[in-house]
């Protein structure tokens, strides 16, 4: 054996080294990697040192027997059967109240012939529960509402008005309050006939002046 090189590096079970035929001189770096389903135990990078010894002990390739942490899901809690997620472990996701689960609630860590163990599914999502709209209120008798829709989304406001000669009793505007279920902030108002005195006192008399006869007017008629 030469005395100016590091010792020959062997192949390792269930893995390989690169380069496969390294020069064994000082400064040479050799990297060990494992086949799918195995992971490096020890240092994967070895370097030929000044004193012609390798910087680290030879690593080994160990079978991967667990899944990676599938992670937390926003707006949820999770129940874990085994903290290191070995094959057979389960993770159950439960959405916080007001959120709806999209995907699988329970994931199971499964072994695979080739490659590392894998979760039965990807982590789910917890989406905000859709707030139900408020049902449209009918316009008060002798009045109107705007907008005139059958369903009003949570947060929307509707406005009420009364026909001439009627006054509004109640709230002129009411809101669809978001909730489970969504609900109107107030009962719908009513339109009450104004007293005749009040009706006349509240109005001034406008006299409209008729336009002078003109050829334009004649033409229009």
């Amino acid at each position: 054996p030469r005395n100016d090189t590091c010792p020959e590096l062997p192949e390792i079970p269930n893995g390989w080294k690169s380069p496969s035929q390294p020069e064994l001189v000082h400064g040479t770096v050799v990297t060990y990697q494992c086949y799918p389903g195995y992971q490096v135990v020890g240092s994967s990078v070895l370097m030929c040192q000044w004193d012609l010894t390798w910087s680290e002990d030879l690593p080994s390739c160990q079978r991967v027997t667990s899944c990676h942490d599938p992670g937390d899901v926003e707006h949820s809690r999770r129940l874990i059967s085994s903290p290191k997620f070995p094959v057979g472990a389960t993770v159950q996701y439960i959405c916080d109240q007001g959120f709806v689960l999209m995907g699988s609630s329970i994931l199971t860590c499964h072994d695979r012939q080739a490659g590392s163990p894998k979760w039965s599914d990807r982590a789910p999502k917890c989406l905000l529960e859709q707030l139900k709209p408020c049902h449209g209120l009918s316009a008060p008798e002798n009045g109107a509402r705007s907008p005139e829709k059958q369903l009003h989304p949570a947060g929307a406001t509707i406005h009420f008005s009364c026909a001439p000669g009627y006054v509004l009793k109640g709230q002129a505007s009411i809101k669809c309050v978001p909730g489970h279920p969504s609900h109107w902030s107030d009962p719908p108002p009513i339109c009450r006939a104004a007293s005749l005195d009040g009706f006349y006192n509240s109005r001034s008399l406008d006299v409209a002046k008729a336009p002078a006869a003109s050829s334009t007017l004649d033409a229009a008629h």
Partner: antibody, heavy 120, light 106 residues
Framework: EVQLQQSGPELMKPGASVKMSCKAS????????MHWVKQNQGKSLEWIGE????????GYNQKFKGKATLTVDKFSSTAFIELRSLTSEDSAIYYC?????????????WGAGTTVTVSS | QIVLTQSPAIMSASPGEKVTMTCSAS?????MHWYQQKSGTSPKRWIY???KLASGVPARFSGSGSGTSYSLTISSMEAEDAATYYC?????????FGSGTKLEIK
Amino acid sequence: EVQLQQSGPELMKPGASVKMSCKASGYTFTDYNMHWVKQNQGKSLEWIGEINPNTGGTGYNQKFKGKATLTVDKFSSTAFIELRSLTSEDSAIYYCTRGGYDHYWYFDVWGAGTTVTVSS
Amino acid sequence: QIVLTQSPAIMSASPGEKVTMTCSASSSVSYMHWYQQKSGTSPKRWIYDTSKLASGVPARFSGSGSGTSYSLTISSMEAEDAATYYCQQWSSTPPTFGSGTKLEIK
């Protein structure tokens, strides 16, 4: 009738561990998650964590991680809570309580509670 | 975590009187649940999903609210209603409880 029967009171020394039990009857044990709630003397309630009796899966309030361990014995329909490294702060009533079926956000049946007193 | 503040902390009411207690959340929640606890006993589920009465709860009880403001109302106080009432949310993990309203009979 659905019942949760809890073990008797415990008088413990600081630094010790205690394990309490909660035996369920009157329903299918594996259909409902079991929760544990702490109530300090004359104070409010704190959720410790829960366990799914079917999978053994557990979830904890961050505050009680490392303090409490939840387990179940499916065959005897019993849930357990173990508290370690006890201090006077752990003196309280501990309730086991059942989560709602397919409705995981409230507690529908409660045990009578186990009183734990930590004193030297 | 969401903090639930109950008010008043202590209140008293005469038989037949209307009683309202409130639970205010530090962040918006979707639903609120309420528990009744009498001295020396464990809590009982009383109102769930904001307004649904648990089995056996008298119809004089009602619950309402949305967002950060919820309330429990007794339309006509009776002696057996004297207890401490706790609100609870799970719109965010961990679930949290209010500090309780102690209701006494005058």
